[in-house]
C-alpha cells in the first residue's frame, strides 16, 4: 500500500485525488459540526 500522511487532507496519487480526514488540530473545520475556536 502507498503511504499517505493523514494530516495532509488530500494527496494526488496516480493522478487521482485521494482524500483523508484532517487532524482535528488543523483548526479549519474539517469535522462537520464541530465548533472550532471561538466565534470570529
Amino acid at each position: 500500500d502507498a503511504e499517505f500522511r493523514h494530516d495532509s487532507g488530500y494527496e494526488v496519487h496516480h493522478q487521482k485525488l485521494v482524500f483523508f480526514a484532517e487532524d482535528v488540530g488543523s483548526n479549519k473545520g474539517a469535522i462537520i459540526g464541530l465548533m472550532v475556536g471561538g466565534v470570529v
Partner: antibody, heavy 112, light 111 residues
Framework: QVQLVQSGAEVKEPGASVKVSCKGS????????VHWLRQLPEKGLEWIGR????????IYTPKFQDKATLTVDTSTDTAYMELSSLRSEDTAVYYC?????WGQGTLVTVSS | DIVMTQSPLSNPVTPGEPASISCRSS???????????LYWYLQKPGQSPQLLIY???HLASGVPDRFSSSGSGTDFTLKISRVEAEDVGVYYC????????FGQGTKVEIK
Amino acid sequence: QVQLVQSGAEVKEPGASVKVSCKGSGFNIHVYYVHWLRQLPEKGLEWIGRIDPENGETIYTPKFQDKATLTVDTSTDTAYMELSSLRSEDTAVYYCVSSGYWGQGTLVTVSS
Amino acid sequence: DIVMTQSPLSNPVTPGEPASISCRSSKSLLHRNGKTYLYWYLQKPGQSPQLLIYQMDHLASGVPDRFSSSGSGTDFTLKISRVEAEDVGVYYCAQNLELWTFGQGTKVEIK
C-alpha cells in the same frame, strides 16, 4: 445570535439549475471550511463536498463532482452551492455547515 | 466507498432506561495515527443535525455526558445511560477516513 441562514425553498423543472446561498450572521464564514450535505425525503444524510473559503479549494464526493459547484463570496460572507442538470432524484433538503453551525436547510424540489 | 451500516433502524426506548445503537463500517476506521474516524450525529424532529461524538469517543461541546461511544476499528456502539425525552430523533454514524459517508440512521422514539 450566531447562525447560518440559507436561502428559501426552490421548485425547479428537470434539467434546470439552482443556486442555494448560506450567509453567516454574526459569524465570519470565510474563516472555516463550509460543508454541504443533503437529505433525501425520509432518507439519510449525504455529504456533497466542502470549500475552503480562504483559497477556494473544493473537494467533492465523486457522485457530485459534475452536479455541484461550491463557491464563496468573502465580501458578503456568503457561501453558495449551485446544482446543475437537476433531476427528480435531486429533490432534497440541502444543508450548509461551518464550524459548529448548521444552516436551517433549503428544500429543493425538482418536478415537471 | 466506505459503507456504514446501523442497527436497529428503529429503537423504542423507555425514559430513564439505557439505550444503545450499533454501527458497523465496511473498512477499519482506525488509522495508524491512533485516531478512529467515527462520528455520531443526532437529528431531532424538525431540526438540523448536530454533532454528538467525534473521533469515536470525544464528546462534542454541550453534549450531555449520558452519551458515550466505544468500539473497535469496524464495530461501534453509541450508548445513552439514561434516556430523556429530548433524546428522541434520528441518530447517524459517519466516517471521514475517506471522504464522508453516513449510516442510514436509527430512529429513537419513546415507547
